[in-house]
């Protein structure tokens, strides 16, 4: 078990032209808060995958009102650390997602408006117990400066917080500055190197250069029995000069409550009152619940009544994401059929349908031929949302009202001559060809006969219709 800690140092416009003057919109003042999400591994996880290692929300920052003539380079931030306790082993490789959220405080429909201002993702390797790692990340036009670390909480130790160690009053078989680990007493914790001369029997350290004393011993090197010393009664890690550990007068001594929890004594024990977002005997476990208000943009929090059950946000139409933080481009799903134009009105989708189609999604094909007559014996054909007339021979145009020349398309192949006729057209084929369109060569041994022109028609007189 342990705690991942994130310290936001600054958030403000990045360098260069085009940097925003204010995080607030034109609607008025706003304030910032942060959400940290930890995911195991270094793989490119889907944005919607859960924060399996834990998540935390910061408090709201001070209200910011833009001063147009003097934009603040760094915006007022929430105080304090963001802490994400982890129950199991620290994975070493992880994805760190830091979201900067804006809460607009002007008159908003449905309460304050929440919007994601910036999101940075870092995939890192980090050993527990190491120093603070500093980072600067850009997200669009914004710049975020932060530090982070992972630390184990006793009795867990090691780079993954998996080994359970405890100081022992028995003489140690470990080397200088090292303490034995339980349950394997012969295994020794990896060093920090304690202050030179720190008693191997009565002292131990958690930080390099430190010398902490076991109960009953004191002095800068834990060589002096406490009963004969003028013990200062310091508890916890001593300063670099002196200190000792003495039996605490009460169960809340040294405040066993993590993550800002407050301790109150109960008969023979203690009770931690945990801040929002944490629970457990010592407030050591992170558990964002529905009580933390994790759903934005009018989302409804479902489940998550207790920290052991995950919450789900049911998002209003137009929003998505695990916290309803993303606006959906609903038209990207192409809901309008048959070539309809999609309009996202915010409260609803509208489809503007092409001629011949109707319905909320343009799904209904109207009867294109309703009330439409085709002249001169033409028949109406539906399709594509626009009516079309299939005209009788000799007629054309949208409604078959125009006279058409059946020979205009030169239907007779191989030099055949075309004769327009009331029942269609006739091809007079050139020698050596036959067929209704003169498309077949006559076999050499066959006889070719040129059909005579129909009575009443002269070749080359296509304009004459009977």
């Amino acid at each position: 078990a342990g705690v991942f800690e994130l310290q936001i140092h600054s958030f403000g416009p990045g360098p260069g032209p085009g940097a925003p003057r204010s995080p607030c919109s034109a609607r008025g003042p706003c304030r910032l808060f942060f959400r940290v999400c930890l995911k195991p591994g270094l793989s490119e996880e889907a944005a919607e995958s859960p924060c399996a290692l834990g998540a935390a929300l910061s408090a709201r920052g001070p209200v910011y009102t833009e001063q147009p003539e003097a934009p603040a380079p760094d915006l007022p931030l929430p105080n304090g650390l963001l802490q994400v306790p982890f129950r199991d082993a620290w994975p070493g490789t992880f994805s760190l997602i830091i979201e900067t959220w804006r809460e607009e405080l002007g008159d908003q429909i449905g309460g304050p408006a929440w919007s994601l201002l910036a999101r940075v993702t870092r995939r890192r390797r980090l050993a527990a117990g190491g120093p603070w790692a500093r980072d600067i990340q850009r997200a669009g036009a914004w710049e975020l400066r932060f530090s982070y670390r992972a630390r184990c909480e006793l009795p867990a130790v090691g780079t993954a917080c998996t080994r359970l160690c405890r100081p022992r009053s028995a003489p140690s078989r470990c080397g200088p500055g090292l303490r034995p680990c339980a349950p394997l007493e012969d295994e020794c914790e990896a060093p920090p190197v304690c202050r030179a001369g720190c008693s191997l029997e009565h002292g131990f350290c958690e930080q390099p250069g430190e010398c902490r004393c076991l109960e009953g011993w004191t002095g800068p090197l834990c060589m002096v029995p406490a009963s004969t010393s003028s013990c200062l009664g310091l508890r916890g890690p001593s300063s670099a000069t002196t200190g000792c550990l003495v039996p605490g007068p009460g169960p809340c001594d040294g405040n066993p409550c993590a993550n800002g929890g407050s301790c109150s004594e109960t008969p023979g024990s203690f009770e931690c009152t945990c801040p929002r977002g944490f629970y457990g005997l010592r407030c050591e476990v992170s558990g964002v619940t529905c009580a933390d208000g994790p759903c934005f943009n009018g989302g409804l929090c479902v489940g998550g009544a207790d920290p052991d059950s995950a919450y789900i946000c049911h998002c209003p139409p137009g929003f998505q994401g695990s916290n309803c933080e993303k606006r959906v481009d609903r038209c990207s799903l192409q809901p309008c059929r048959n070539g309809g134009l999609c309009l996202d009105l915010g409260h609803a989708l509208r489809c503007r349908c092409r001629a011949g189609f109707a319905g909320p999604r343009c799904e209904h094909n109207l009867d294109d031929c309703a009330g439409r007559a085709c002249a001169n014996g033409g028949t109406c054909v539906e399709g594509g949302g626009a009516h079309r007339c299939s005209c009788a021979l000799g007629f054309g145009g949208r409604d078959c009202r125009e006279r058409a020349d059946p020979c205009a398309a030169r239907p007779c192949a191989h030099g055949g001559r075309c004769y327009a006729h009331f029942s269609g057209l006739v091809c007079a084929c050139a020698p050596g060809y036959m067929g209704s369109r003169c498309e077949f060569p006559v076999h050499p041994d066959g006889v070719s006969a040129l059909p005579a022109a129909p009575p009443g028609l002269r070749p080359g007189d296509p304009q004459r219709y009977l």
Partner: antibody, heavy 118, light 108 residues
Framework: QVQLQESGPGLVKPSETLSLTCTVS????????WSWIRQPPGKGLEWIGY???????NYNPSLKSRVTISVDTSKNQFSLKLSSVTAADTAVYYC????????????WGQGTLVTVSS | EIVLTQSPGTLSLSPGERATLSCRAS???????LAWYQQKPGQAPRLLIY???SRATGIPDRFSGSGSGTDFTLTISRLEPEDFAVYYC?????????FGGGTKVEIK
């Protein structure tokens, strides 16, 4: 103008299943969440559950084991089924549209009284 | 679940008077996700206020909502004859959606 109309039998026998349908006009059922709320005679309002056209549902835990809400987008309708009814389920049943700005109810049907009696 | 307690149960006032209705939540309602409804006998409820203080479309400005956290108030600045009805609050912060028990505003 958005309108909702409840329909279904006004009398149901104990232990049977209450079935109601809400027909929506003036709004696409695919664009909103839709809900059922009931009100026993002379008493307050009780939320039953809601549905989204995608099939997402959420029910009141006090009724969850007996409730099914379904949607028919082709008919612009959604329905309520409440099984194993008792006299305590006698109420006016309202269908309502859930607003876009949050999970409150901006349009309601006029309600239909369902009496559970043998 | 969040339990909403409305008080008083009944408010007896005359037309022209100011009505103040209270709705108290058993847990904090995040982001002021609270709505108010008016219901007249034989009718469905009608949305008045959402987001604790935003008036719904077509609602006269004599109706106003305020409050945050666990304490919310609906105020009718000058009662009109048509305002005598039962008023309900509803939270939509988390599931299950819950209503208050109602406050009846009757003519004195």
């Amino acid at each position: 103008q958005v309108q909702l109309q409840e329909s279904g039998p006004g009398l149901v026998k104990p232990s049977e299943t209450l079935s109601l349908t809400c027909t929506v006009s003036g709004a696409s059922i695919s664009s909103f969440y839709w809900s059922w709320i009931r009100q026993p005679p002379g008493k307050g309002l009780e939320w039953i559950g809601y549905i989204y056209y995608s099939g997402t549902t959420n029910y009141n835990p006090s009724l969850k084991s007996r409730v099914t809400i379904s949607v028919d987008t082709s008919k612009n309708q959604f329905s309520l089924k409440l099984s194993s009814v008792t006299a305590a389920d006698t109420a006016v049943y309202y269908c309502a549209r859930i607003a876009v700005a949050g999970f409150f109810f901006d349009y309601w049907g006029q309600g239909t009284l369902v009496t559970v009696s043998s | 679940e969040i339990v909403l307690t409305q008080s008083p149960g009944t408010l007896s006032l005359s037309p022209g008077e100011r009505a103040t209705l209270s709705c108290r939540a058993s847990q904090s309602v995040n982001k002021n996700y609270l709505a108010w409804y008016q219901q007249k006998p034989g009718q469905a409820p009608r949305l008045l206020i959402y987001g604790a203080s935003s008036r719904a479309t077509g609602i006269p400005d004599r109706f106003s909502g305020s409050g945050s956290g666990t304490d919310f108030t609906l105020t009718i600045s000058r009662l009109e004859p048509e305002d005598f009805a039962v008023y309900y609050c509803q939270q939509y912060d988390r599931s299950p959606l819950t209503f208050g028990g109602g406050t009846k505003v009757e003519i004195k």
